[in-house]
């Protein structure tokens, strides 16, 4: 069954945590649907963003942070492992110095920490996708 | 009650027709939600687009056409009559030489015809909005 989109869930992250998302683009790549995943510092959507991950399907991925309400320097990748019309599984793992983003089991993007992952309080998944799975796995200490 | 998004409806347009849309952005303007309205030449979403109207709420509006699968010259406007968090009523009227876009009763954008409005077979409304009304009014002959 489908999860509501935008999908918002409280989350606590640290090294070893993984966020897993399964979904499907709502439109063909010609129409440039988007997927966005935002790691927020508060439960409010207007809060700062520790890690912003936005896919323009078929075109590019941009990653960034929003600090004190302002977007910082964008990191762009043309790597496009997503398939037109196909379901995807996205996993974002918290490594000691960066986020590692896997798409369908393949390491596809990295983003070095600008803000501590421990500052994350909420994850939001939204834009032009249907969502079937959202999970945060925590490192067993 | 809410209409499904993306929302797709068969439509025939000509001078005098008006497409009316009521909805609300799904996120605060800081997060840059989008609204897109596309007038397609076929019932297929990958078909050409006679009039493409995309709002990046709080930032800008772009208008364009897609002909033989390729985007043409984009028209951009910084005019932003939409209000953060507020419902909007959008009406797109087919005038003899152009589309006239009204937002909450106020004339806000125009787009000169590149392709005959009679070529339109389908209208799609999508991206980051909830949709409460969609109507196509036809000129009484």
């Amino acid at each position: 069954s489908l999860l509501p989109v935008p999908y918002t869930e409280a989350a606590s992250l640290s090294t070893g945590s993984t966020v897993t998302i399964k979904g499907r683009p709502l439109a063909c790549f010609l129409n440039e649907p988007y997927l966005q995943v935002d790691f927020h510092t508060e439960m409010k959507e207007e809060s700062d963003i520790v890690f912003h991950f936005q896919v323009c399907f078929g075109r590019r991925v941009v990653m960034n942070s929003r600090e004190y309400g302002a977007w910082k320097q964008q990191v762009e990748s043309k790597n496009m492992p997503f398939q037109d019309g196909q379901e995807f599984e996205l996993s974002i793992s918290v490594l000691p110095d960066k986020y590692q983003v896997m798409v369908n089991g393949q390491s596809s993007y990295t983003f070095d920490h600008r803000i501590k992952p421990e500052a994350v309080k909420m994850v939001q998944v939204w834009r032009d996708i249907s969502l079937t799975k959202f999970n945060v796995s925590y490192l067993k200490r | 009650s809410l209409l499904p998004v993306p929302y797709t409806e068969a439509a025939s347009l000509s001078t005098g027709s008006t497409v009316t849309i009521k909805g609300r952005p799904l996120a605060c303007f800081l997060n840059e939600p989008y609204l897109q309205v596309d007038f397609h030449t076929e019932m297929k979403e990958e078909s050409d687009i006679v009039f493409h109207f995309q709002v990046c709420f709080g930032r800008r509006v772009v208008m364009n056409s897609r002909e033989y699968g390729a985007w043409k010259q984009q028209v951009e406007s910084k005019n932003m009559p939409f209000q953060d968090g507020q419902e909007f009523e959008l009406s797109i009227s087919v005038l003899p030489d152009k589309y006239q876009v009204m937002v909450n009763g106020q004339s806000s954008y125009t787009f000169d015809h590149r392709i005959k409005p009679e070529a339109v077979k389908m209208v799609q409304v999508w991206r980051d909005i909830s949709l409460t009304k969609f109507n196509v009014s036809y000129l009484k002959r």
Partner: antibody, heavy 121, light 107 residues
Framework: EVQLVESGGGLVQPGGSLRLSCAAS????????MSWVRQAPGKGLEWVSP????????SYVDSVKGRFTISRDNAKNTLYLQMNSLKPEDTAVYYC??????????????WGKGTLVTVSS | QSALTQPSAVSVSLGQTARITCQGG??????VSWYQQKPGQAPVMVIY???ERPSGIPERFSGSSSGSTSTLTISGAQAEDEGTYYC??????????FGGGTELTVF
Amino acid sequence: EVQLVESGGGLVQPGGSLRLSCAASGFTFSSYAMSWVRQAPGKGLEWVSPINSGSDSASYVDSVKGRFTISRDNAKNTLYLQMNSLKPEDTAVYYCAKARTSVVAGGMDYWGKGTLVTVSS
Amino acid sequence: QSALTQPSAVSVSLGQTARITCQGGKFGSYYVSWYQQKPGQAPVMVIYKDNERPSGIPERFSGSSSGSTSTLTISGAQAEDEGTYYCQSGSSSDNIVFGGGTELTVF
């Protein structure tokens, strides 16, 4: 072994210009953020301008905005600082520093020995 | 990122524990690094990511952060630890800031 060697410092009159260079070796230069940090005589450390990896945009401490320009040439493994309209208060040792990662958030793990810039008439 | 405040000087007897504080940061969100600088030399990183030590830095150096205060602790201070210590925090380039520096004396 990581090495950062600054050059281009010297004595310059107020209103003059200098271009500092930092030659980097021993690491993949293009993968790391870099920064210029200065230290006026007897004073503390002050960020001048950091630049993230592969970046064509940068930021500057308020006191040098519009006068200084940081740039990097990843092909030449070199960091630059173009300093225009120099003022006496720009007199300092200028250090080139390498970040631990592609952004400066995680700190600067290697520093050059510094080059002295003196602005005086 | 607002200014970071450090005491201008800290004294400690040989072999005792020295604590240098850094206040005013948003340390719940931003990492802290600490640097040691000896006269006429370039700074050397002694702590990064709040509490991690670069290779070659003795175990007596440690760090901790909570709220708006970060602390550098030198357990069993040695004569060679004398110098000026700077904290640094922030994230993206326009948020980076140094503390004013603390001169450590070991007597």
